[in-house]
């Protein structure tokens, strides 16, 4: 079954197609469905979920996070500049999330699957924004590096990487979700 | 206090137009993706109309499409519904509604309505 | 009008315990957790009880519950008072980018 996809969409293909917004919210919970599994494998195999030095961690990452200045939170709420954020958020995402990439055992395929998920949800969302500014790309050249930065840490930070990323991601899925309930 | 303030309805003819307005205060109107809901005389409540936070997105039950337009002035904190081809089906009370924040499609609040009534 | 049903008029004693159903399909109420619950009381607007199937709206009493199962939601009043006597109305978000309300139940608390 496709992400986003009832089973028994696909089986009755002559049933509604799901809506611009019915996609995005399904493609989103899809991928938080998926961040849970990963998080689940991370957490059993490490006691990062409980550890208490993830500041050290952090400050190697610039994860994307929502701030006031987005207009993503329900004071100063702003629809244009939201949706701005939310695509552009995604696609800083990709390099981490390609990190994460050989970084599960049991769990490889869905860590694929957020990623591959991710990917058609931008799409979506970019469709949604298309009559809006231009959204910059990451730069090619600064991802790969970052990623090879990555991969170069001991074990520890590695684990601590991909606990933080999920957890971020996680965080960032969750407000978009509640501002496209306004869009 | 978060309040929705209706005012616009009245007596209309058949194929008649009439523009209802709902004036909000209490709280930030351009954060809220707001609706309009009627409620035919002895009847159950009709969603007509949604509009997002910022404008860009409109939704319409089928049946006002193409007669009824719903906009918005964030400006000025106000939520409009251009009804015309007004039909008698169309008689009820007109509630101004706000979505709740973050969630998909439920009403946290409700103004006190302003009636239609489409007579000849 | 495009309705999900609801039966016309439900009554309990006060203390008791009362269920009104709604019943729509996998368009509807059977598609995600989109259902939510109105009090009306007479000559009033509605009132937001229960949003998301089982969220009880801010202020709301935890007398009142929600649940659902497949293509039917239900709305639960326990411990009936005076007060409740009104007009209860499901919502859920219907395919296609719409609402869609019940037809309404009239709760008569007796005696």
């Known amino acids: 079954v496709p992400p986003g996809e009832d089973s028994k969409d696909v089986a009755a293909p002559h049933r509604q197609p799901l809506t611009s917004s019915e996609r995005i919210d399904k493609q989103i919970r899809y991928i938080l469905d998926g961040i849970s599994a990963l998080r689940k494998e991370t957490c059993n195999k490490s006691n990062m979920c409980e550890s208490s030095k993830e500041a050290l961690a952090e400050n190697n990452l610039n994860l994307p996070k929502m701030a006031e200045k987005d207009g993503c939170f329900q004071s100063g709420f702003n629809e244009e500049t939201c949706l701005v954020k939310i695509i552009t958020g995604l696609l800083e995402f990709e390099v981490y999330l390609e990190y994460l990439q050989n970084r599960f055992e049991s769990s490889e395929e869905q860590a694929r699957a957020v990623q591959m998920s991710t990917k058609v949800l931008i799409q979506f969302l970019q469709k949604k924004a298309k009559n809006l500014d231009a959204i910059t790309t990451p730069d090619p050249t600064t991802n790969a590096s970052l990623l090879t930065k990555l991969q170069a840490q001991n074990q520890w930070l590695q684990d601590m990487t991909t606990h933080l990323i999920l957890r971020s991601f996680k965080e960032f899925l969750q407000s978009s979700l509640r501002a496209l309930r306004q869009m | 206090e978060v309040q929705l303030v209706e005012s616009g309805g009245g007596l209309v003819q058949p194929g008649g137009s009439l523009r209802l307005s709902c004036a909000a205060s209490g709280f930030t109107f351009s954060s809220y993706a707001m609706s309009w809901v009627r409620q035919a005389p002895g009847k159950g409540l009709e969603w007509v109309s949604r509009i997002s936070s910022g404008g860009i997105s409109t939704y319409y039950a089928d049946s006002v499409k193409g007669r009824f337009t719903i906009s918005r002035d964030n400006a000025k904190n106000t939520l409009y519904l251009q009804m015309n081809s007004l039909k008698p089906e169309d008689t009820a009370v007109y509630y101004c509604?706000?979505?709740?924040?973050?969630?998909?499609?439920?009403?946290?609040?409700w103004g006190q309505g302003t009636q239609v009534t489409v007579s000849s | 009008q495009s309705v999900l049903t609801q039966p016309p008029s439900v009554s309990g004693s006060p203390g008791k315990t009362v269920t009104i159903s709604c019943a729509g399909t996998s368009s509807d109420v059977g598609y995600g957790n989109y259902v939510s619950w109105y009090q009306q009381l007479p000559g009033m607007a509605p009132k937001l009880l229960i949003y998301?199937?089982?969220k009880r709206a801010s202020g709301i009493a935890d007398r009142f519950s929600g649940s659902k199962f497949a293509n039917t939601a239900s709305l639960t009043i326990s411990g009936l008072q005076s007060e409740d006597e009104a007009d209860y109305y499901c919502a859920s978000y219907k395919r296609g980018d719409n609402a869609v309300f019940g037809g309404g139940t009239k709760l008569t608390v007796l005696g």
């Open positions: 509604v706000r979505y709740a924040w973050g969630v998909q499609w439920a009403f946290d609040f």
């Open positions: 998301d199937v089982n």
